[in-house]
Interface confidence: low
């Protein structure tokens, strides 16, 4: 899985004027990292992990980024016409991969009042724009806006792609966050689903990073796809991962069944405990 | 220090009128987009409607418009709501607030208004 | 309008307790959300804007996550000064809305 930077800033307009905040949300690897807090004017990291991965480093750099976001898309939204009456936002969000081949990827999406309205694959510079007349009209717009100087255009989108992946660069090469493997817990429990049935469940949690293999075998072979409910791969808010998967089986079967994880080329097999437990309520779930 | 304070509150028949006002202090009101929410007694809160900094544009919940009228005068530092055709629902304390720019962490300590016949 | 859905309405609990109250959005709403404390009688506090943002001089045992439409409170350790009605609000479009509120009693 490639490691990924995603930031997420969205303007709003009130009746054709342009507020003078923004919301900002940047996630590292699919987790929560920083938030730009508009009653401090600082970017904040989000929990202990975020600050971790910076060290005793400042966050003025990436408050200095995130509030220059801020402005150039305040002035992208002021050059949208069709802006009548009451609120409106405007949002882009822009994602930067680095996979472990070390290839690259960027890509940067507009949304006018939650509708996307504007892609743009930000190494190749190819804009993709939905079919709708009203997508059509608002990436004219923007474009227009946006190619208004074409020389500044090209570097501010080369500049953009360049900056997303320098800071990714800069967080994996400071961090031991980053780089670290941590193992999942794994938990089996049981309930009682229905007459001669119960449902078995297992979670893995805590772990990093996020690729992991969480299956029920049976008689030591994979259970089909169709016969297993699977949880999102979720972040849990201290920069490390939680999943589960569960099944249903027959009473008195339990023995026949095990839960199969692997992690960063290490695997275990965790058995269904014996005894009635009936668990109620579950928070991953 | 930061503060809003109302007055106008009084008891009124239906379908006569009533004016608050709301003094700010200790910040630019001049910067800061103001509203006008209340809470019906043992009612939670409902926002009424907003003025821009400017005074320029307003926004007005379903329940009031077309009956009340929101303005400011920032060379006095007041955010006024005129009411009219009061209907014995919007018997309420009636707060001013404001914050950075719409979560208000800025509150007045609200006015009674009872339409009551 | 975009309707606030709390949950839930009233909640009773003991001191030391972990608590949390949810708020769940008719559509996203970005992390445009805050919540609120009412004591009776008293004006509301701001405890959290920005969905997750501590209101500066609120204990940090208050604390607020998520953004689209799932939004939480959670009071990690309950003092006994936290027992009130707690309301979140969205100020992502207009007409601004509030939540209905959940009330917090002693058990």
């Known amino acids: 899985e490639p490691h990924s930077l995603r930031y997420n800033l969205t303007v709003l307009s009130w009746d054709g004027s342009v507020q003078s905040g923004f919301l900002a949300e940047v996630h590292l690897d699919g987790q929560p990292f920083l938030r730009y807090d508009r009653q401090k004017c600082r970017a904040k990291p989000q929990g202990q992990w975020a600050e971790d991965v910076l060290g005793n480093k400042t966050w003025d750099r990436e408050t200095r980024d995130l509030t220059g976001n801020g402005k150039d898309l305040r002035m992208t939204l002021a050059h949208i016409k069709d802006q009548k009456e009451g609120l409106h936002s405007l949002q882009e969000i822009r994602v930067c991969e680095i996979h472990e081949d070390n290839s690259t990827r960027s890509s940067q999406h507009f949304y006018y009042d939650g509708e996307l309205f504007l892609s743009q694959n930000l190494e190749t510079e190819e804009w993709t724009v939905p079919q709708s007349s009203r997508a059509q009209t608002l990436a004219m717009n923007v474009r227009n806006f946006l190619k208004e100087d074409a020389m500044k255009t090209k570097t501010h989108y080369h500049a953009m792609h360049a900056d997303c992946l320098q800071e990714l660069r800069r967080y994996l090469e400071s961090s031991v966050v980053l780089r670290r493997t941590v193992p999942p817990m794994v938990n089996v429990t049981r309930s009682e689903a229905s007459e001669g049935n119960i449902t078995v469940t297992c979670r893995a949690s805590s772990f990093y990073p996020r690729n992991i293999t969480l299956t029920w075998r049976q008689d030591g072979v994979s259970l089909s796809h169709d016969t297993q409910q699977w949880g999102d791969v979720l972040p849990d808010g201290n920069g490390t991962y939680q999943t589960w998967v569960a099944t249903r089986i027959c009473q008195g079967e339990e023995q026949r069944f095990t839960c199969y994880m692997e992690h960063s080329g290490n695997h275990s097999t965790h058995p269904v405990p014996s005894g009635k437990v009936l668990v109620l309520q579950s928070h991953w779930q | 220090q930061v503060q809003l304070v109302e007055s106008g509150g009084d008891v009124v028949q239906p379908g006569r009128s009533l004016r608050l006002s709301c003094a700010a202090s200790?910040?630019?009101?001049?910067?800061?987009?103001i509203h006008w929410v209340r809470q019906a007694p043992g009612k939670g809160l409902e926002w009424v409607a907003v003025?821009?900094?400017?005074?320029?544009?307003?926004y007005y919940a379903d329940s009031v418009k077309g009956r009340f009228i929101i303005s400011r005068d920032n060379s006095k530092n007041t955010l006024y709501l005129q009411m009219n055709s009061l209907r014995a629902e919007d018997t309420a304390v009636y707060y001013c607030?404001?914050?950075?720019?719409?979560?208000?962490?800025?509150w007045g300590q609200g006015t009674m208004v009872t339409v009551s016949s | 309008a975009i309707q606030l859905t709390q949950s839930p309405s009233s909640l009773s609990a003991s001191v030391g307790d972990r608590v949390t109250i949810t708020c769940r959005a008719s559509?996203?709403?970005?992390?445009?959300l805050a919540w609120y404390q009412q004591k009776p009688g008293k004006v509301p506090k701001s405890l959290i804007y920005?969905?997750?943002s501590l209101e500066s001089g609120v204990p940090s045992r208050f604390s607020g996550s998520g953004s689209g439409t799932d939004f939480t409170l959670t009071i990690s350790s309950l003092q006994p000064e936290d027992f009130a009605t707690y309301y979140c609000?969205?100020?992502?479009?207009?007409?601004?809305?509030f939540g209905q509120g959940t009330r917090l009693e002693i058990k």
């Open positions: 607030a404001s914050g950075p720019p719409d979560a208000f962490n800025i």
């Open positions: 200790g910040f630019t009101f001049s910067n800061y987009n």
């Open positions: 003025i821009r900094y400017d005074g320029i544009n307003k």
């Open positions: 559509q996203g709403i970005s992390s445009a």
């Open positions: 920005d969905a997750s």
């Open positions: 609000q969205q100020f992502n479009s207009y007409p601004i809305t």
